[in-house]
């Protein structure tokens, strides 16, 4: 007998052919050999089976014998062996129904799991391989788990249930909620204005919650409360700043935060915590912030950088247009008895600038 | 075993609108089509139509337009509406189920009965 | 709708005697037709499904046959408790239909 594979609240047709192609009587039949739907003369007639409502056929095609039953929003319980009686003869086809679902909402935060639930016919045993939507192979049976989830798991997942060298393709949206990026420096000089973004890397209808930043100075033995918020409906308003800093923020998405100087007090690391409405857990994004300060002082040319910064980052002090440099794997460099010109202050990672400050020194008669 | 148990008042005004409920005990609500029959004094069965918690539910042509069915899953309770009644609609009113297995359909248990009469 | 006729529409026998009820469908409804008594003030119950199948606790003496459109229903031998109402109700296409009933009195 012919397997059919359906999923859980698609539509199903399973097709039944009599050899002359003229319209004749058929019936449709489940296994306990009550009526689903049949002709009589021209018009189509249903059974009492629980199918009676969600059952249909292509009558546009019965003058051609074929006499199709088409189910629709199919159910794990109607798999069952359904008959078709043409032309004396009967046709069976068992119908198996499938549904995956994910076990929680599909709108999940990063680091949470992913539990994949199958639901199959009494009697069957697939198996079940997913694709995530960065390449990812899951392989599995009843259940699917994804332990940690990471934003690049946010996408279409595509899963194939295999029965009787059979498949059926389902697809799964999920959404990771996550910040776009994980970690984010910004690079300043003194007394610039520092602008901090934190884009999403998902887009909700409603989006509620309430965030903080907190911050770590360097330069501080503890951490503190920068500033708190709420948002609503992607509206955003503050609810409590600090005296010092006085940072200011966007009203509107992305959440945008701006410093109005860099100064060396200020250089640390912070974390931007958002806890959304209905959600257990809190998105993070930890910023950075380097402050690089160039100044003269007697006969002392001194730069000097504050703030989390690699070893791996180079400090220099150049003479424009001349070969005269000191460069340093640390945090401060300096020049004694500098000659005039000006002088470029480089924060550089392999060759990379990120950051770059100049200081005239004019000559001491 | 299941037992059904019409309810429902005995008088209803013409033109208004009949309410009944039937209660289920014994089982569950779940997975059975559930059927409204009617039996005006000395006269033949009337299948009103039938509910499931699964499906839509399926009514007699000749009442449609003024038949509601429903189901309370939590109460193991289904209901008829039928509106606008007149005089003919003056009967017995039985819920039953019904039930199918191998070549086997048909109304196993039914409730004993609510007598409806339709006057002002 | 199919219409279901039942004769006949009432009938007089003894204790003993064998009857026979005949029910027509207006097309063919192969064997999905069953039988039920009813007695007075108390609700239906089913006797015979598909046609020809006993239901269970039900006395053997009653018995149903045919397919299509042409069925009958018998009792082999009539018993005092047997005096009721039949019906056929036919179940091959929505909405289910019942014949008028035969009435079965004591003579």
């Known amino acids: 007998k012919k397997v059919v594979l359906g999923k859980k609240g698609d539509t199903v047709e399973l097709t039944c052919n009599a050899s002359q192609k003229k319209n004749t009587q058929f019936h449709w039949k489940n296994s306990n050999q009550i009526k689903i739907l049949g002709i009589q003369g021209l018009f189509l007639t249903k059974g009492p089976s629980k199918l009676s409502d969600r059952a249909d056929s292509r009558k546009s095609l019965w003058d051609q014998g074929c006499f199709s039953m088409i189910i629709k929003n199919l159910k794990i319980e109607d798999s069952d062996t359904y008959i078709c009686e043409v032309e004396n003869k009967k046709e069976e086809v068992e119908l198996l129904v499938f549904g995956l679902t994910a076990n929680s909402d599909t709108h999940l935060l990063e680091g949470q799991s992913l539990t994949l639930t199958l639901e199959s016919p009494p009697g069957s045993s697939p198996s079940v391989k997913c694709r995530s939507p960065g390449g990812k192979n899951i392989q599995g049976g009843r259940t699917i788990s994804v332990p940690q989830l990471e934003r690049q798991d946010s996408g279409t997942w595509t899963c194939t249930v295999s029965q009787d060298q059979k498949t059926v393709e389902f697809k799964i949206d999920i959404v990771v909620l996550a910040f776009q990026k994980a970690s984010s420096t910004v690079y300043k000089k003194e007394g610039e204005q520092v602008e901090f973004s934190f884009p999403l890397a998902f887009t909700l209808e409603k989006l509620t919650g309430s965030g903080e930043l907190w911050w770590q100075a360097e330069r501080a033995s503890s951490s503190k409360s920068w500033i708190t918020f709420d948002l609503k409906n992607k509206e955003v308003s503050v609810k409590r700043v600090t005296q010092d800093p006085k940072l200011q923020m966007g009203k509107k998405l992305p959440l945008h935060l701006t410093l109005p100087q860099a100064l060396p007090q200020y250089a640390g690391s912070g974390n931007l915590t958002l806890a959304l409405e209905a959600k257990t857990g809190k998105l993070h994004q930890e910023v950075n912030l380097v402050v690089m300060r160039a100044t003269q002082f007697q006969e002392n040319l001194t730069c000097e950088v504050w703030g989390p910064t690699s070893p791996k980052l180079t400090l220099s002090l150049k003479l424009e247009n001349k070969g005269a440099t000191v460069s340093k794997q640390a945090k401060a460099v300096w020049v004694l008895n500098p000659e005039a010109g000006m002088w470029q202050c480089l924060l550089s990672d392999s060759g990379q600038v990120l950051l770059e400050s100049n200081i005239k020194v004019v000559p001491t008669w | 075993q299941v037992q059904l148990q019409e309810s429902g008042p005995g008088l209803v005004k013409p033109s208004e609108t009949l309410s009944l409920t039937c209660t289920v005990s014994?089982?569950?609500?779940?997975?059975?089509?559930w059927s409204w029959i009617r039996q005006p004094a000395g006269k033949g069965l009337e299948w009103i139509g039938r509910?499931?918690?699964?499906?839509?539910?399926n009514y007699n042509p000749a009442l449609k337009s003024r038949v509601t069915m429903s189901v309370d899953t939590s109460k193991n309770q289904f209901s008829l509406k039928l509106s606008s009644v007149t005089a003919a609609d003056t009967a017995v009113y039985y819920c039953?189920?019904?039930?199918?297995?191998?070549?086997?359909?048909?109304?196993?248990?039914w409730g004993q009965g609510t007598t409806v009469t339709v006057s002002s | 709708d199919i219409q279901m006729t039942q004769f006949p529409s009432s009938l007089s026998a003894s204790v003993g005697d064998r009857v026979t009820i005949t029910c027509q469908a207006s097309?063919?409804?192969?064997?999905?037709l069953n039988w039920y008594q009813q007695k007075p003030g108390k609700a239906p119950k089913l006797l015979i499904y598909?046609?020809?199948n006993l239901e269970s606790g039900v006395p053997s003496r009653f018995s149903g046959r045919g397919s299509g459109t042409d069925f009958t229903f018998t009792i082999s031998s009539l018993q005092p408790e047997d005096f009721a109402t039949f019906y056929c109700?036919?179940?091959?296409?929505?909405?289910?239909?019942f014949g008028q009933g035969t009435r079965l009195e004591i003579k």
């Open positions: 109700q036919q179940y091959d296409t929505l909405p289910i239909t």
């Open positions: 039953a189920r019904e039930l199918e297995r191998l070549n086997y359909y048909g109304m196993d248990v």
């Open positions: 598909d046609a020809s």
């Open positions: 097309q063919d409804i192969s064997n999905y």
């Open positions: 014994g089982g569950s609500i779940s997975r059975y089509y």
């Open positions: 509910i499931c918690t699964s499906e839509n539910p």
